[in-house]
Structures are given as C-alpha cells and as structure tokens.
C-alpha cells in the first residue's frame, strides 16, 4: 500500500473539528499581481505582505502596491498601505528586514523620473509605524544591515557610490565612489571593490579591494588586481589576476585582509569561475570550474587556514557562472551535504557525504522501492534527489530539499530511484537519520514544510488544478491525514511558515478566479489543538547520529566525536513547543589517520590512509610553493581536519620537513624563486 494508506496507521482523533476551529481565511481586496511575504522578527507573529500590480501603459508602467500586516502569524491582516502614503514599493528590493529581533524594516519606494534621489520607508517597531525618508541617491541595491548593529546600513547607488547610514537610514553619507561590490564583514567592517578607469565590467581583474573599519572615516587598500571577493565563515577570499596571463587564482585571509596567502587551488581562466559552496569558521567547500563549457567542476575542501585544499568530489554539477548547483547543506545533521555529479554518459547522479566532504557515496535505495525500468541492474540502484538544477530545468519539482537544525535527522526531498535523476514525475522521500536511509513519503510532487521542530510535517499536492486539501503527519511522514481547509478550491501559489520550523501555523497562499476578477487569498491553519499536550521526558528516545555499525567501537564517530540526541518518538503526538532546544550529548572519539588531512606537499595513495610525500611538485602545487608564505612550507605531512575534536589514539607525529628545499629544485633557479616570493 502507498505510504500512509495503512489501516493500522496512527491517527489523530477528531482532527477535522480541531483544525476547522483553527483555520483562518483572509481575502485581499486587490487585484492579483505578485505577492511577497516577510516575517519580522522571531516568534513575534508579525508578517508583512506586499502585493504589487503592474499595468503596462504606452510610455510607462503604472504600478500599484498594497502593504498588509499581521501580528498573529497570518490569521488576520490589516491594510497598512496608508502608513507608507500609498506609495508604490519596488519589489526587486523586497522588504529589507533587520537582523535578529531588531524589529527594523526598510521598504524602497518607486519614485518618478526626475527626482534627485530615491525614497525609503523605515520602521523600527515591527512595522507598526513608518517614517518616510528621501535619499540623496538612487539605490542600486537593497539596504544592507550590519550584522552587528542594525542601525548601520549600507547601499550602492546607481552611480556606483557607496553610501552609509549610522542612524538607521535617517541620514546618509557617500563614503566612496566607483564601487562595484560592498559587503559587511565582522565588527562593522565594510569590504568593497573599486574601479579606477572605466567601469566595474571594464576593470574586472584590475579592481582594488578596500576595507574600512570605522564606517568610512579611514580606508585601507587590502588587494589589487582583484576580479571578485567573497566572505565565508572567518575567511575572506579574493580572486586575483595573474601577472603574466588572463588566469586568476584564489587568495585567502583570516585577519580581515591584513595578510594574504595563496590558496593551493588550481588557477582558472576567463571563462571559468570559483564558487564558495559552503563555509563555516572551520573550513570552506570551494567549487572550481573545469575549463570549457562542461557544466561541471571539482569540489575542494580546505584546511583550517583556508590554504591547503583536498580534492573532495570530481565532476560536480555546476552550470556556467551564476548557474545552478544542487549543493545542499543538510542542516539537520552535522557533516552531511548532498549534491549532484555529471557522469561520463551525461546523466546526473546524486551523491552524499556524511563527513564534511571526506567521502562521497550514492544515496541508499529506499526500502520497499523498485529500481526504475531503465536501471541497468534491477536490484542495485540509488535514490537521486531533485534540487536547484531540476527546478531550473522546469521539471515537475516544486521544492528543493528541506532540512531544519531543530528537526534532527529529518531530510525531505523529491527524488527518483534508478541509475540517475529521472525526468519522470518524482515522488517525495524522507530520511529520519540525516540521509543514511530513505523512505517514500508521498506519491507525486508536493510542497512540504516542517512545523514544531519536526512534530508535524505538512504537505500540499503540486497540481495545475485548484486545490482545497492539505496533508499532515505527526510521525515523521509515516502516516498522513488529509484536511479540507476550504469548500471552494483555490489556485495554490505557496506554503508559508515562520522560518526556523518552530511555529505551529501554516499559511496556504493562492488566488481565486471568477469571471471578472481574481483575488489573493490566504488560509492560516494553527495545529496547536492537534498536538494537545506538551511533550514530556517519556515522549523522547535516545538516538546516536551517524550510527552504521554498533559492533564498531567508534560507531557514530564523525570528525572526532559522536553525538547522542533526544528525539521525539514517532508515536508521541505532543508539542515540542516554541522554546524547544535540541538536547544532545557529545562524546570524544579516539583519533585515527582519517581524522587528518594531508598537508601541502603530501598526498594519500588510493586505498591508503597514510600521507605520503609528493615526489615532485607540479602545477598549482608548484605555484603555491613559489608564492606561498614561508611558514606554510614547514610541515609534518598531516593536519587535523577542520572541526575534528578527536583525542588520543593515533598521533601521526613525524619529522618536520622544510618544503622550501623542494621549491628550489630544478623547476626554477633560486634567484627567480626569491624574487617571486612575498
């Protein structure tokens, strides 16, 4: 039988009446154009909804927008368009919501042609009131809040000026001209690139990277010949043009740009790109594009300095610059990432790593599932997950994979079972152990969301026809119940729940269409009465993450430690609640050679865990050798994997080698080498 169709499925009793009493409809009395929705703050219940409607006239476009506010998670909305003087809001800038629970909101208005500058509306009380402010410039980008102080804003103007406000947009000051890209760093630092001659495009590869730590009083040039820059975790990266040709390579800094080291990564040509896939304070995943228009590249993982890189995954699918990659951080379990590779026969296959990129494998075939008819071997195939690439290819995939840090182990995704990703209509699969094992959860494509830290999963079928039914599960997707939330079906456009998966409320957005008009409508369902009681100690069970073999002494050890979690029992129908905190207990593991990566100048032969000295340095190894800082060329061959907490056990101590000797081998004469080193 299909998932959840079992007569013996655990059922929530009398749920129809409970949900009917907690279903709230709101019809928006304006025409259907586009709608954008933002939560203001965490656990405040405040939602802002901006509806916009464009009427293209002969010479210009006439636009109308309306602003609505809810303070009860979307059950009721109030039209507050008058608070912004009925001004048309520019949707491409969205609603700039302040960090944390600052309660700050900035809306950027559309202003008529000849004005001196733009206009914003500012609120610092969770959108109860707005202040209109005319700007001395026309904004090119959305206002960017400093992560450390929400009163500090920066924006780029259409004339490439860098503007800063220290009083939440009340007053603005241009701190630099000819700016291409600007980003907040830590401690209210601003990093930005500038051009000298023509424009950002013309000067690409000849840009300068600047830093200001005092909001524009003083500046320091921290890089030249810059192509682009990026921030990830505690790392600052810049791609820098080579002296002699059109290639560029990555340099990295961990001290805000005061000192730089060359990353031991391949250089790339004009048509190639680098991309930071994920970064934290320990390490970074870097994608390096392959030469030519291949649509793939290589993933490298860094050491703790961001300098030495290990090849992690070949043929990683990433379409040309700014394109699509399926790389997904599974936030519900430490160390887990999912992505796609382009195989030799041009089919796309899903790969998963459980140890932060150390090893990649195919996803295990779900129990009780058949391999697709096209599979070479009917018994041996894998689950393949649809993500951004499938969505970009307009396959019948309404949502990317979903995981939440507070819903431990749960991953939900569209997928198909076979040798590769299929263009057939996918089903929805769920893993409750962070991707080790999978089960078919729902037949056909669906929208889905996680509520109450995993206590409830909600889904809506993806259909071109109007819908009026929502499905929900209280046991991590094993059993499903359906609820008809309205008599009159609506054209569904989206599911919305408060970010963080702690809420018990879900909003179903759509529009109704009649002979003459169409209107936006939302239905907000509160599941609080389905989960009648608060969870108690007896509702939780203990679970060891990353467990694959209980007979192995180090079962569950990933990156040097194992973690046990208290997890809600599937049979418990109770509220985790908004204040739920994941209970976990780490225990340190003994070190093995797998807890170490090979340092610069060393490599692991296939099927060997020991790091062996490279007989000769070639390619980017040699370049690193030439341009690398001296202290990075002294090594014992091993470095602990970033974030690895192992203790005792194997300690690969060996004599410290000075690799500078290799650098002055027969590749380059010492004079040449000295003149090039920095």
């Amino acid at each position: 039988s299909a998932p959840g169709e079992d007569e013996e499925c655990g059922r929530v009793r009398d749920f129809v009446a409970k949900l009917a009493n907690n279903t709230h409809q709101h019809v928006f009395d304006d025409l259907r154009g586009s709608v954008s929705l933002s939560w203001v703050g965490d656990s405040t219940g405040v939602i802002l909804v901006l509806t916009t409607f464009h009427v293209p006239l002969v010479i210009m476009t006439f636009g109308q927008s309306k602003l609505y506010r809810s303070e009860d998670y979307g059950k009721n909305f109030k039209d507050i368009t008058d608070l912004i003087n009925n001004t048309f809001i520019r949707t491409e800038f969205g609603m700039a919501i302040g960090p944390e629970n600052s309660g700050k909101v900035v809306l950027t208005a559309e202003v008529s042609g000849g004005s001196r500058g733009g206009r914003i509306f500012r609120s610092s009380d969770f959108a109860k009131n707005f202040v209109q402010t005319d700007l001395p410039f026309h904004p090119l980008t959305q206002m960017m809040y400093s992560p450390q102080n929400s009163d500090y804003l920066l924006a780029l103007s259409t004339e490439n000026g860098l503007w800063v406000s220290k009083n939440f947009g009340g007053k603005w000051e241009e701190i630099h001209k000819a700016v291409c890209l600007a980003k907040w760093g830590s401690d209210n630092t601003i990093f930005f690139t500038t051009y000298a001659n023509g424009s950002c495009k013309a000067d690409l590869g000849a840009l300068e990277l600047w830093r200001t730590s005092d909001l524009g009083k003083s500046f320091k040039t921290i890089g030249v010949k810059i192509y682009s820059f990026g921030l990830g975790g505690r790392f600052l990266f810049a791609s820098v043009m080579a002296d002699k040709d059109t290639t560029r390579r990555i340099h990295v800094s961990t001290d805000q740009g005061d000192t730089w080291s060359m990353a031991q990564l391949p250089s790339v040509g004009q048509e190639q790109f680098y991309s930071i896939l994920a970064a934290n304070d320990d390490m970074v995943f870097m994608h390096v594009d392959e030469p030519g228009d291949t649509g793939f590249g290589t993933i490298f993982t860094s050491d703790d300095r961001g300098i030495v890189y290990s090849k992690s995954l070949d043929r990683h699918l990433y379409t040309t610059t700014g394109g699509e990659t399926d790389f997904t951080n599974v936030t519900s379990l430490r160390g887990v990432y999912i992505t796609s590779v382009l195989s030799e026969d041009n089919s796309i296959q899903t790969m998963i790593t459980f140890d932060q990129g150390g090893r990649w494998t195919h996803l295990r075939k779900p129990e009780n599932s058949e391999c697709a008819a096209t599979a070479k071997n009917k018994n041996e195939c894998s689950l393949h997950i649809h993500a951004s690439y499938s969505i970009s290819q307009k396959l019948n995939v309404p949502m990317a994979p979903l995981s939440e840090p507070n819903a431990v182990g749960i991953v939900i995704a569209h997928g198909s079972v076979g040798d590769a990703i299929s263009v057939m209509v996918p089903d929805v699969y769920i893993s409750d152990d962070g991707g080790y094992s999978w089960t078919k959860m729902l037949e056909g494509p669906h929208y889905y969301t996680i509520l109450d830290s995993g206590g409830i999963i909600v889904a809506i079928e993806h259909s071109s026809r109007p819908i009026n039914v929502i499905k929900f599960s209280t046991d991590e997707g094993q059993c499903w119940q359906t609820y008809t939330f309205t008599r009159d079906p609506i054209y569904f456009t989206g599911l919305a729940s408060e970010p963080g998966a702690r809420s018990m409320n879900i909003s179903i957005w759509g529009f109704t269409e009649s002979f003459l008009t169409s209107q936006w409508v939302s239905y907000t369902i509160d599941f609080k009465d389905i989960l009648e009681r608060n969870c108690e100690e007896k509702d939780y069970t203990i679970w060891l993450a990353h467990s694959t073999d209980p007979e192995d002494y180090e079962d569950g050890c990933i990156l040097g430690y194992k973690e046990q979690f208290l997890r809600l029992r599937k049979s418990s129908v109770c509220q985790n609640g908004r204040d739920y905190v994941v209970t976990k207990q780490p225990s340190i593991c003994l070190c093995s050679l797998e807890d170490f990566l090979c340092d610069f100048g060393y490599y692991r032969p296939e099927n060997d865990s020991k790091c062996v000295e490279q007989p000769e340095l070639k390619g980017h190894d040699l370049e690193f050798c030439l341009y690398g800082r001296e202290e990075h060329l002294t090594t014992n061959g091993y470095r602990k994997i970033p974030g690895d907490k192992c203790q005792g056990g194997v300690n690969p101590v060996r004599e410290v080698k000075d690799l500078k000797k290799k650098c002055t081998s027969n590749f380059l004469s010492p004079e040449k080498q000295n003149s090039k080193s920095n």
């Epitope: 013996e8 499925c9 655990g10 059922r11 152990d433 080790y436 094992s437 046991d475 094993q478 059993c479 007896k538 069970t541 203990i542 679970w543 060891l544 993450a545 990353h546 467990s547 209980p550 007979e551 192995d552 002494y553 079962d555 569950g556 194992k562 046990q564 029992r569 599937k570 049979s571 418990s572 207990q585 225990s587």
Partner: antibody, heavy 124, light 106 residues
Framework: QVQLVQSGAEVKKPGSSVKVSCKAS????????ISWVRQAPGQGLEWMGG????????NYAQKFQGRVTITADESTSTAYMELSSLRSEDTAVYYC?????????????????WGQGTTVTVSS | DIQMTQSPSTLSASVGDRVTITCRAS??????LAWYQQKPGKAPKLLIY???SLESGVPSRFSGSGSGTEFTLTISSLQPDDFATYYC????????FGGGTKVEIK
C-alpha cells in the same frame, strides 16, 4: 559472542536496598543500551529501565521512578541496577539484557542478549 | 504508558499445528514490536524484532506481522521445543510487555 554475567542471588530485608551487577564480555558494551527486566514468581516480564553506557543516559519506567538507579562503568563493561526501599513484592528474578540495535535508535529492536538472572528475595 | 494486551493467555496445541498469538497496543507503535520465547527457569529469548524481522538463529517457522496497533506471532508448524510462554514487547514508548501466552501440549 557477547555474554552478560550477573551477580549472585541476594536475600534482603524490607526497607533496605539491593545492587545487582551485569558484566558484559565479548562485544562493544558501550554502543548498546542495557535494560533491566524483572519477573516475579509465576508472573510476566516487567521493564524497569535502561542505560546507554556512552554518556550514561538512563531512563526509568514510571512505576520505579525514584526507587531505581541504573548506572554503567565503561571501563569494566559493567552495568548496575540498584533498587531501594525494598518490599516483599520486589521478590523476583532480575535480568539485565542488551538492546539489539540496527540503527541509531537504542531501544527499538528488542533485547537480543540476556543475563542468566539474579534472584532477589525480600523477606523479614 | 502504552499498554500491551496479549491473547490468548493460554493456548493448547499439538505438534504440527499452526499457532497464532495476537498482541494489541493501546496506541500506534508503528512496527516497533518484539516477540520473545521463555521456558521455565530460563531467560527470555528474542524471536522477532521490528514486528516481522526474524532474529538470526531463530527457525523460519516463526514469523511476525502487523503494524500500528495489531500484531501477530505465527508458528507455522509447532515443534516439541516450542512449548513455552511467549511475550510481546513494544519499544516505541517506555518499554512494556504483554501479559504472556502459555503454549501447552493439548
């Protein structure tokens, strides 16, 4: 092959405490939960509680909460069950059992290895 | 706590008979059910875990089925060694056992 060897029979007075040990050999003690189950004469099986040696996470059946303490010593691969405020109805055979495990869940797969049982008699 | 009701409490059968014991949970426990066999003076022995998975070394005449709240242990052809007491045990809440079914010679 994993074995669980329990301490010998005990005779106790009402109101006193008893501590039964369960030593594991031949397996990875730390990676499995150990449960304690008792069986009064002519009666069925009754779960008292369990412990996971890594981290020492113990949980108890409601009936015994506050009266039973389960501990584990990883270094000697030994689990202990102490029952206090003994009464005559606590006369039973006390078993320790290893919870089989196929995934990360400790208690879901049945008890695959049992100790030989320890008879505790409570009598004045 | 989840209650487990086992039936019958006693069952008389002959060698070669097909024997069925049922166990009902007071709420859904998915497939988290185990079956044990116990002989007088001995510790229980695990037969079935996760409702239908046969423990290694257990004869294939033993089988388990069910999910949610209704479960069954079946002995396809009763052997002399099978006369014993059988217990079901749920593992999705704090562990609880059924009251037991004594299989005796008819």
């Amino acid at each position: 092959q994993v074995q669980l060897v329990q301490s010998g029979a005990e005779v106790k007075k009402p109101g006193s405490s008893v501590k039964v040990s369960c030593k594991a050999s031949g397996g990875t003690f730390r990676n499995y939960a150990i449960s304690w189950v008792r069986q009064a004469p002519g009666q069925g099986l009754e779960w008292m509680g369990g412990i996971i040696p890594i981290g020492g996470w113990a949980n108890y059946a409601q009936k015994f909460q506050g009266r039973v303490t389960i501990t584990a010593d990883e270094s000697t691969s030994t689990a202990y069950m102490e029952l206090s405020s003994l009464r005559s109805e606590d006369t039973a055979v006390y078993y320790c059992a290893r919870q089989g495990r196929k995934t990360g869940y400790y208690y879901y797969y049945g008890m695959d290895v049992w100790g030989q049982g320890t008879t505790v008699t409570v009598s004045s | 706590d989840i209650q487990m009701t086992q039936s019958p409490s006693t069952l008389s059968a002959s060698v070669g008979d097909r024997v069925t014991i049922t166990c009902r949970a007071s709420q859904s426990i998915s497939s988290w059910l185990a079956w044990y066999q116990q002989k007088p003076g001995k510790a229980p022995k695990l037969l079935i875990y996760k409702a239908s998975s046969l423990e290694s070394g257990v004869p294939s005449r033993f089988s388990g089925s069910g999910s949610g709240t209704e479960f069954t242990l079946t002995i396809s052809s009763l052997q002399p060694d099978d006369f014993a007491t059988y217990y079901c045990q749920q593992a999705d809440g704090h562990i609880t056992f059924g009251g037991g079914t004594k299989v005796e010679i008819k």
